[in-house]
């Protein structure tokens, strides 16, 4: 807390500029008008204030806006955002994607902080759902964002948002998350033709049921082994040898290298030896 002292003669700030870096903390408190600071927030980032000086500027804004900062100020916080606590951020009403981007930029390259997480939560709740543009932005800054959400949270993602998802965004998703995302992806990509559809749906197939895998096996998709190994075991088990052969195409030879790992191991044990022998891979059921 900075003590209240009168501003020395001739030191009253007329604008936010570089001369302020030479002000002591108490001089900033006494000589910088909070309303002036709020209207010229965009200048603060161009000035090399110390952390202590930034604390004073934050204190002035807190006094001016005890109920939370307006978006016109939030958008231009820049590095001052790093001084905000989650409690501060919970008071904000952030509706503009540009504001969100500006603040995510400040934290770029770092792990998601509690401040950023709170900001994102406020933003998404304000919008009512995780729409495509928001998801696009969040996954650009935090590729693991989608897989950090619970299945319950993912259920509120509209199918249209799935277009923003890249394969790497799903790398750390667990089966229960893919169970929720797969039907949305199927709906989102339903009007694409066979080969294009497979390219888009491939990353989501860890949530696919048996009947959809059977349907894909009729379409010459040539699924790679990495994708096959991520399929749900319960979805793979009912597939016949012929269906797996069609599903994998030329990649079927890769089953030999994976014969001790799930779901391949469990699938092999379910097949008749005669059928396995037709593959010519030496798989033992």
């Amino acid at each position: 807390e900075v003590e209240k002292t009168a501003c020395p003669s001739g030191k009253k700030a007329r604008e936010i500029d570089e001369s302020l870096i030479f002000y002591k903390k108490w001089e900033l408190e006494a000589c910088v008008d909070a309303a002036l600071l709020a209207t010229q927030m965009d200048r603060v980032n161009a000035i090399p204030f110390t952390y202590e000086q930034l604390d004073v500027l934050k204190h002035k804004l807190d006094e001016l806006y005890p109920q939370g900062y307006p978006e016109s100020v939030i958008q231009h916080l820049g590095y001052l955002f790093l001084k905000m606590s989650p409690e501060d951020i919970r008071k904000w009403n952030v509706t503009s994607l540009e504001t969100l981007k500006a603040l995510l930029e400040v934290n770029k390259g770092h792990e998601m902080s509690p401040q950023v997480a709170t900001l994102i939560d406020r933003f998404v709740k304000g919008r009512g759902q995780l729409d495509k543009d928001t998801l696009d932005t969040l996954t650009a800054f935090y590729p693991g964002y989608l897989c950090s959400l619970s299945p319950e949270e993912l259920s509120s993602v509209p199918p249209s948002s799935i277009w923003a998802v890249r394969p790497q965004d799903l790398d750390t998703c667990d089966p229960r998350q893919l169970d929720v995302l797969y039907p949305k992806a199927r709906l989102a990509f339903q009007n694409m033709n066979g080969s294009e559809y497979f390219v888009k749906i491939q990353s989501f197939l860890g949530g696919a049921p048996t009947e959809d895998l059977k349907a894909l096996s009729q379409q010459n998709v040539s699924m790679d082994l990495a994708t096959f190994m991520k399929l749900r075991t319960d979805a793979v088990l009912p597939l016949t040898v012929a269906e797996v052969q069609k599903l994998l195409g030329p990649h079927v030879e890769g089953l030999k290298a994976e014969e001790r790992h799930r779901p391949v191991r469990d699938w092999i044990l379910r097949q008749r030896q005669d059928d396995l022998d037709t593959l010519g891979l030496g798989l033992q059921g």
Partner: nanobody, 124 residues
């Protein structure tokens, strides 16, 4: 091993407030959840508030929405439940719960670790 200890329960008049706190130790998962459940006598254990431990998203039961607020305090390593405008029907034993490694705190069966509980009694 995750260890959860609740505190802050007690008796309060309807319309009053309480703040429950759950001290968390041994929780290292960056992907997971913390929740507050409650159980009234003769009723099923129900989840009232959820917080995603990585992205701090929150979910509330319809019956407590806009009255309860769950938050994580990194410095103290606690997960708190601020309960405002309490009603007699909020009377229950309140439990802190943690989920990780594919557990998402959606149901009581979907929890990895439980606290011992703290009693909240709201009288009219």
């Amino acid at each position: 091993q995750v260890h959860l200890v609740e505190s802050g329960g007690g008796s309060v008049q309807a319309g009053g407030s309480l703040r429950l706190s759950c001290a968390v130790s041994g929780y290292t998962s960056s992907r997971g959840c913390m929740s507050w459940f409650r159980q009234a006598p003769g009723k099923e254990r129900e989840r009232v508030a959820y917080i995603n431990m990585r992205v701090l998203t929150t979910i509330y039961a319809a019956s407590v929405k806009d009255r309860f607020a769950i938050s994580r305090d990194n410095a103290k390593n606690t997960v708190d439940l601020q309960m405002n405008n309490l009603k007699p029907e909020d009377t229950a034993m309140y439990y802190c719960a943690a989920g990780y490694n594919g557990q998402w705190c959606e149901h009581a069966s979907d929890v990895t670790a439980w606290g011992q509980g703290t009693q909240v009694t709201v009288s009219s």
